[in-house]
């Protein structure tokens, strides 16, 4: 018998800490950092995974502004505070107790302040524009090949529901992909869009989060598709609140 | 070497409550996970409840509600506390030590639930 | 609940010969986490059970070799491949795959 068969891991993610001590001595895995058990059939939430991954490098993401309501990123790397099913608290502090407000893939949405701030409620990320750039290729990609290939890539891989990607746009060499799912679309066991955005962010950048399967290798009608940059814009269902100097 | 000691097994009438336990040694109790599985006069095996390592509990819906798996780290002794007893309760309950199943049973205790 | 098909009900056998049991269940066993959680579980005359195999074809430790899990999805098989005394009593198979756990009926194995 293979000693892999006798071991638990997680499939959907490898920052995890696994053994059979669940239900019944099934696997059960929890998440490092937070010691949370996850379930390992779908993607793990991102409050989690950058709880995970507190050692990695700073340069977590960046985000530009499609509009004035778009929020950038540039606080970089955290250790958030996740609430019992792993999603962000609206309220994060670090430990200076100096607090912010963030949306729901943990993006700080209004001006710093102390422990006094409120943050009412978790005002969800309903809207996330992905934009690549590719290596340069031969010729350009056929869109509809490529639409194809990139909502397959969303259903097979993140397992996130077709009817949540919108849009994918191809202007050589650039591919936006929209991803939209409001509050009330989101059904129990449904993958939350950020954090498949998140997956897919890790995944292009060559850090894939998931267990021993192959990194992402991209292919349109069998020519590689090479990400040489990627940019995420976030648009939340409230506008965010920053003072006129910001 | 793992040993699993049930007690607490008893004639009750129905309508009643009793509260087994099961002495648990021969492995760190607190790493485990472990449940209480039951066998009927009729020899057939039924399970009853399971606690997680994280001390998550897991119950069938013919028991919800009416059985509470617990444990006392500070002892390493499982429960099984049963309320509102009823005669198709009559059983040897087996408390067991889990990994991938239930790896390892201890000899039972036998419940009588009977006017 | 996932009914746990067992068959045959007896099987008398004589020393040193093999032996088979099958287990089907209602439904398919393969856990969403690649894992098949099916075992198989001796009951000796007056004894408490005792789990011969788990993940399908893992034994035990202290099982003997003899002792054989196969089976994959829906249809499990617990081979013996020659009896000897002290297997004698009834055998269980178990899912623990989908919630309520449940056991098999039993197969009694007797000396013909």
């Known amino acids: 018998h293979t000693a892999a068969q006798d071991n638990c891991t997680c499939p959907t993610n490898k920052m995890t800490v696994c053994s059979p001590d669940g239900p019944g001595g099934r696997c059960q895995c929890r998440a490092l950092g937070s010691g949370v058990a996850v379930d390992c059939s779908t993607l793990t939430s991102e409050c989690l995974l950058l709880k995970a991954r507190m050692s990695a490098p700073k340069n977590a993401r960046t985000l530009v502004r499609p509009n004035e309501h778009a929020l950038v990123d540039n606080d970089g790397l955290y250790d958030p505070d996740c609430d019992p099913e792993g999603r962000f608290k609206a309220r994060q502090c670090n430990q200076t107790s100096v607090c912010w407000c963030v949306n729901s893939v943990g993006v700080r949405r209004t001006d710093k302040g102390d422990l006094s701030l409120r943050c009412d409620e978790l005002v969800r990320t309903h809207h996330i524009l992905i934009d690549l750039r590719h290596r340069p290729t031969a010729g350009a990609f056929n869109h509809s090949d490529l639409d194809a290939e990139l909502r397959r890539l969303f259903r097979e891989r993140y397992r996130l529901h077709p009817k949540f990607v919108a849009a994918v746009h191809y202007e050589q060499p650039t591919i936006q992909i929209e991803l939209r799912q409001n509050t009330s679309q989101k059904a129990a066991g449904d993958v939350d869009i950020g954090d498949a955005a998140y997956y897919f962010e890790r995944d292009v950048k060559g850090e894939s989060l998931f267990q021993g399967r192959g990194g992402l290798d991209l292919r349109v009608r069998g020519e590689p598709l090479q990400v040489e940059r990627t940019l995420i814009y976030y648009l939340d269902e409230i506008p965010p609140k920053f003072s006129m100097k910001r | 070497e793992v040993k699993l000691v049930e007690s607490g097994g008893v004639l009750v009438k129905p309508g009643g409550s009793l509260k087994l336990s099961c002495a648990a040694s021969g492995f760190t109790f607190s790493d485990s996970a472990m449940s209480w599985v039951r066998q009927t006069p009729e020899k057939r095996l039924e399970w009853v409840a399971s606690i997680s390592r994280g001390d998550d509990t897991y119950y069938p819906d013919s028991v919800k509600g009416r059985i509470t798996i617990s444990r006392d780290f500070a002892r390493n002794i499982l429960y099984l506390q049963m309320t509102s007893l009823r005669s198709e309760d009559t059983a040897m309950y087996y408390c067991?030590?889990?990994?991938?199943?239930?790896?390892?049973w201890g000899q039972g205790t036998l419940v009588t639930v009977s006017a | 609940d996932i009914v746990m098909t067992q068959s045959p009900l007896t099987l008398s056998v004589t020393i040193g010969q093999p032996a088979s049991i099958s287990c089907k269940s209602g439904?398919?066993?393969?856990?969403?986490?690649?894992?098949?959680?099916f075992n198989w579980l001796l009951q000796r005359p007056g004894q408490s059970p005792k789990r011969l195999i788990y993940?399908?074809?893992m034994l035990d430790s202290g099982v003997p070799d003899r002792f054989t899990g196969s089976g994959s999805g829906t249809d499990f098989t617990l081979k013996i491949s020659r009896v000897e005394t002290e297997d004698l009593g009834v055998y269980y198979c178990w899912q623990g795959t989908h919630f309520p756990f449940t056991f098999g009926s039993g197969t009694k194995l007797e000396i013909k």
């Open positions: 439904q398919s066993l393969l856990d969403s986490d690649g894992k098949t959680y």
């Open positions: 993940l399908v074809s």
């Open positions: 067991t030590r889990d990994r991938f199943g239930f790896a390892y």
